[in-house]
Interface confidence: low
Amino acid sequence: VPRWRQQWSGPGTTKRFPETVLARCVKYTEIHPEMRHVDCQSVWDAFKGAFISKHPCNITEEDYQPLMKLGTQTVPCNKILLWSRIKDLAHQFTQVQRDMFTLEDTLLGYLADDLTWCGEFNTSKINYQSCPDWRKDCSNNPVSVFWKTVSRRFAEAACDVVHVMLNGSRSKIFDKNSTFGSVEVHNLQPEKVQTLEAWVIHGGREDSRDLCQDPTIKELESIISKRNIQFSCKNIYRPDKFLQCVKNPEDSSCTSEI
């Protein structure tokens, strides 16, 4: 008789999840010699231990502490780039501007980027059929708690000028319910962070509006200012040109506004 299995509203664990995590860990330690000491098998064991045999709606930050400890990494605290709803461009940027880091440029962020995972209460099985959806099922699911944990730690580590890339094509350029709006903004440390600089990325080629005047950006400015952190905002009208000029700052066309 097949055992009854909880059906969740979200997609199941990513195919070949264990192999993917291990492979990514190995690849990361190849590219980053400062993380060469990391034992990827232990990392996987700690990752697995955070959610296997646990109810996937009852995961806590505490469950991820062994993994957090193993993945401890020092990134230059003044070179942090946060993003919201514009991951691809943020990652393209840090691939070019190699001295800046998004969360996904760190080991733990790299391991989990774009993956889904969950287990089942009281069995050692990984659930490849379905996992809890944050809205429809529960917020304390393995994926959401992981990102909340690593995002909080990443924001806490930031210092000096912190940059955030925001998507100017969305109705809410700053969304209080995003990971950036609900976790990272509130965990920047005012005693370390002097300024949060927002880069609002425009979508349309003919869009010349000043999106820094958008009501949601003003809301972000208000939240940040109340936390005794200065706020500044820049429009990035031409993201393609922006990336090109990061690559080749000497290009004559890069002196004009981008």
Partner: antibody, heavy 123, light 107 residues
Framework: QVQLVQSGAEVKKPGSSVKVSCKAS????????IGWVRQAPGQGLEWMGR????????HYAQKFQGRVTITADESTSTAYMELSSLRSEDTAVYYC????????????????WGQGTLVTVSS | EIVMTQSPATLSVSPGERATLSCRAS??????LAWYQQKPGQAPRLLIY???TRATGIPARFSGSGSGTEFTLTISSLQSEDFAVYYC?????????FGQGTKVEIK
């Protein structure tokens, strides 16, 4: 029980190629490396290269660059080492070995070895 | 590449005696060093990894020490089955490299 079983002895003509296989059984479903080492008669051990099957990432020692190709077929748990443009000094026993340590460029120690494949290059 | 130098080339020891084998790296390899034993006609066998950790099933009479550039393999009381060639290998930098080997023979 974890073991690596290599293909049988080969006799080859100078200028030809040889392809040695190494079939793994009982390996855990994890990221490991398969390294290739050779030992000429009465000589010491010499690294040729290695591959991480799950990543399909191969690296070769400078001495063999351009002449050696290491591949792996995850579906059959088999790694292959092909050496081309053979010369008499390539006569050696060729070993494959399983590497643990979970890093790419470094920190692999080799705990399980194949039985070795004797390749004789002679005209 | 990192050059590994083993000494002595040959060590003559009586059964029951202690054997000390040395391995020197041309630059630091941290603790990323392994020791292997090889008998005639056989594949190498891992004895020690991480400079000092005994591999599974290796008797306690084998011990490794050192870090950086100087390493030692000690066999506290040689048994008849321990007479073989011993190789050190660094796995800190690619290409990994072996020492030229130390032959431990019966005195």
């Amino acid at each position: 029980q974890v073991q690596l079983v290599q293909s049988g002895a080969e006799v080859k003509k100078p200028g030809s190629s040889v392809k040695v296989s190494c079939k793994a059984s009982g390996l855990p479903d994890a990221t490991y490396a398969i390294g290739w080492v050779r030992q000429a008669p009465g000589q010491g051990l010499e690294w040729m290269g290695r591959i991480i099957p799950v990543l399909d990432a191969a690296h070769y020692a400078q001495k063999f660059q351009g002449r050696v190709t290491i591949t792996a077929d995850e579906s059959t748990s088999t790694a292959y080492m092909e050496l081309s443009s053979l010369r008499s000094e390539d006569t050696a026993v060729y070993y494959c070995a399983r590497g643990l340590g979970y890093y790419l460029y470094s920190s692999y120690y080799f705990d399980i070895w194949g039985q070795g494949t004797l390749v004789t290059v002679s005209s | 590449e990192i050059v590994m130098t083993q000494s002595p080339a040959t060590l003559s020891v009586s059964p029951g005696e202690r054997a000390t084998l040395s391995c020197r790296a041309s630059q630091s390899v941290s603790s990323n060093l392994a020791w292997y034993q090889q008998k005639p006609g056989q594949a190498p066998r891992l004895l020690i990894y991480g400079a000092s950790t005994r591999a599974t099933g290796i008797p306690a009479r084998f011990s490794g020490s050192g870090s950086g550039t100087e390493f030692t393999l000690t066999i506290s009381s040689l048994q008849s089955e321990d007479f073989a060639v011993y190789y050190c290998q660094q796995y800190n930098n690619w290409p990994w490299t072996f020492g030229q080997g130390t032959k431990v023979e019966i005195k």
